[in-house]
Amino acid sequence: KESCDVQLYIKRQSEHSILAGDPFELECPVKYCANRPHVTWCKLNGTTCVKLEDRQTSWKEEKNISFFILHFEPVLPNDNGSYRCSANFQSNLIESHSTTLYVTDVKSASERPSKDEMASRPWLLYR
């Protein structure tokens, strides 16, 4: 049976390999039944997740799911790290899995590593 609880469907252990200077949209898939919940993004700093207050966000609606999007325009080197979205629903806080951005700084990278390289050898990003 379909639950009417809010669900945040960021993939577990997900990663995105992106270039500094490019635009990027980080999506938080949100499933809800009636009223759209209030959703926020935060960036992990150790064990705490620091709320991203002044960042551009938007909603995108699809047939069975909605997306709360965090916009990077453009991606900066210090956007590297792990992010999480969370929703307030009936006075409960629901947190997503974290998703990790691996940012390559084009100025310092002589050549762009492949997706497979970046997934298996993230230290390449810090050469």
Epitope: S14, S17, A119
Partner: antibody, heavy 119, light 112 residues
């Protein structure tokens, strides 16, 4: 309902490559992971790796890194596994597995594809 | 890699009797998100595997409630309260906490 339909059986010679396909339906392919698991005759299950169809990001068991390549085509909702430099030990049934919204919990299994490597 | 060790590797059970399979991992499967990514799969002869239990103890829909899962950290158990003829096959534990994900070697269940 979720369905994973895999390509037909393959017979290959040692040193050759094989490319297997897995067509998904009944769910949003981009919102999940596609995993590949294999099973040699009379043996146990072995996880090969997984791909995120939304961005092509892959994770492999180091045992298969460099010889296995997973790709995904979101236009056709199809995941692919290519295995190169085949040897007799690669004879196995290869399963495509999907999970619910990227939970990495191996929810749904395809019917499997038998790959036979023989000279 | 995390090694998953199942015992016994085979068991023969009389219908209506209970059965128990143990699975031990070489390190704790408790993830940083507070969940333990330990599943049990059943593979009947000639069929694809199917998931019975996920996150240690959650029963998949359509799975009879005679199946149950328990455990924490490194020690996990699959129990069948009353074995039936349709339960024959091989049972695998699996961990999804650490890459690479790994399976136990399997336990073959036969009916006496």
């Amino acid at each position: 309902q979720v369905q994973l339909v895999q390509s037909g059986a393959e017979v290959k010679k040692p040193g050759a490559s094989v490319k297997l396909s897995c067509k998904a339906s009944g769910y949003n392919f981009k919102h999940t992971y596609a995993h590949w698991v294999r099973q040699a005759p009379g043996q146990g299950l072995e996880w090969i790796g997984r791909i995120d169809p939304a961005n092509g990001n892959t994770k492999y068991d180091p045992k298969f890194q460099g010889r296995a390549t997973m790709t995904a085509d979101t236009a056709s909702n199809t995941a692919y596994l290519e295995l190169s430099s085949l040897r007799s030990e690669d004879t196995a049934v290869y399963y495509c597995v999907a999970d619910h919204y990227g939970s990495s919990l191996l929810d749904y299994w395809g019917q499997g594809t038998l790959v036979t490597v023989s000279s | 890699d995390v090694v998953m060790t199942q015992t016994p590797l085979s068991l023969s059970v009389t219908p209506g009797q209970p059965a128990s399979i143990s699975c031990k991992s070489s390190q704790s499967l408790l993830d940083s998100d507070g969940k333990t990514y330990l599943n049990w799969f059943q593979q009947r002869p000639g069929q694809s595997p199917r998931r019975l239990i996920y996150l240690v103890s959650k029963l998949d829909s359509g799975v009879p409630d005679r199946f149950s899962g328990s455990g924490s950290g490194t020690d996990f158990t699959l129990k069948i309260s009353r074995v039936e003829a349709e339960d024959v096959g091989v049972y695998y534990c699996w961990q999804g906490t650490y890459f690479p994900y790994t399976f136990g070697q399997g336990t073959k269940l036969e009916i006496k």
